[in-house]
Amino acid sequence: QSGPLPKPSLQALPSSLVPLEKPVTLRCQGPPGVDLYRLEKLSSSRYQDQAVLFIPAMKRSLAGRYRCSYQNGSLWSLPSDQLELVATGVFAKPSLSAQPGPAVSSGGDVTLQCQTRYGFDQFALYKEGDPAPYKNPERWYRASFPIITVTAAHSGTYRCYSFSSRDPYLWSAPSDPLELVVTGTSVTPSRLPTEPPSPVAEFSEATAELTVSFTNEVFTTETSRSITASPKESDSPAGPARQYYTKGN
């Protein structure tokens, strides 16, 4: 075969947003018959020639960026897309409110505001049932997420997180849920006016993986402004389908 082997996929099950002390599994999926997998934690010198990482209880030191690749014969694949494993519940939850209120007419405007008592410069808003992450900068303890020309598609349950760009994989606990109610009829579904979602891969049970445990290792995290989606819901236990709207510098 000429050229590099196609990249595998790397997913976090059940989610890439993991509360401290809760379980998560990282799985690397390549084609059948792979000779060797390599799963590595970026910004550390740690890697394992295995393709699955079972974590019984999430730790701060495990948060960060991961990627994997595989080898067939003497050929190495391209690396997977990076997976960003986030530890949540590291800080107290922010509060989430809607201005002018959580009930809004279709076609109207609403602003969701996430506020924290800490000096965080990053905020993430997600809507249950939607698939991907967004970003947008803000500082000074609060972030506003305007939703222009609201449609029925914006109805749902929202939560937000706060965190620091200096430790981008250590997040607060989620805010209490805010239920946004849209009254009237909707013409077309719309999204927040921010960047488009990242593509999300699905987990297939035919994955070739091995077991490995990083749980006794101590890792460092590297500052990054990129927060990716957690895995999309699929037939195998996978991540929650949620949409993220992230504000940061």
């Epitope: 059940p14 699955v52 974590i55 070739a208 236990p237």
Partner: antibody
Framework: VQLQQSGAELVRPGTSVKVSCKAS????????IEWVKQRPGQGLEWIGV????????NYNEKFKGKATLTADKSSSTAYMQLSSLTSDDSAVYFC???????????WGQGTTLTVSS | DIQMTQTTSSLSASLGDRVTISCRAS??????LNWYQQNPDGTVKLLIY???RLHSGVPSRFSASGSGTDYSLTISNLEQEDIATYFC?????????FGGGTKLEIK
Amino acid sequence: VQLQQSGAELVRPGTSVKVSCKASGYAFTYYLIEWVKQRPGQGLEWIGVINPGSGVTNYNEKFKGKATLTADKSSSTAYMQLSSLTSDDSAVYFCARSIYYGTIDYWGQGTTLTVSS
Amino acid sequence: DIQMTQTTSSLSASLGDRVTISCRASQDISNYLNWYQQNPDGTVKLLIYYTSRLHSGVPSRFSASGSGTDYSLTISNLEQEDIATYFCQQGSTLPYTFGGGTKLEIK
């Protein structure tokens, strides 16, 4: 995915028994194996979990010293040994596959253990 | 240990009914809540994992929701094959624990 457990056992109090669970239809070392107890007409009790790839185990405190979990990668078989048996150990024991800690996606058919003199 | 409570131990319903089974945890389990079905022959199957995710091959008439400590399983259009005992289980914190079960019967 199939988890085939060994057959029913009738044993004397004070003895030990080893229940087997043969996995097929998937790569044995890619998933965890958990064990669950169910006494007649009662609920389910989690015993423990083993990572077949590494041999790492976690037990319910209640079953430490009672249950020992092992796995043989070459035969894709998990085992649970129960020691110092009493009538309280009479139950159906399930092995099950889990995709991450604490979430079982496939169950064995169960092995009935009867402890009686 | 986290206690899982299914307050209704048995439930009678008619075919075609919408049935809801509830489960309460003694502390926040962060959506690590699974639902299992045990048939009269003793076989156990996963229905729902991580609060609301439908396992492969499970009919869409099954759905579930919840957060924090309160969770529920709903069968929207009860069929004969749904007659079974339903268990909730938390996979949040060791040791993982199950509810006492809710036995579903036909009226």
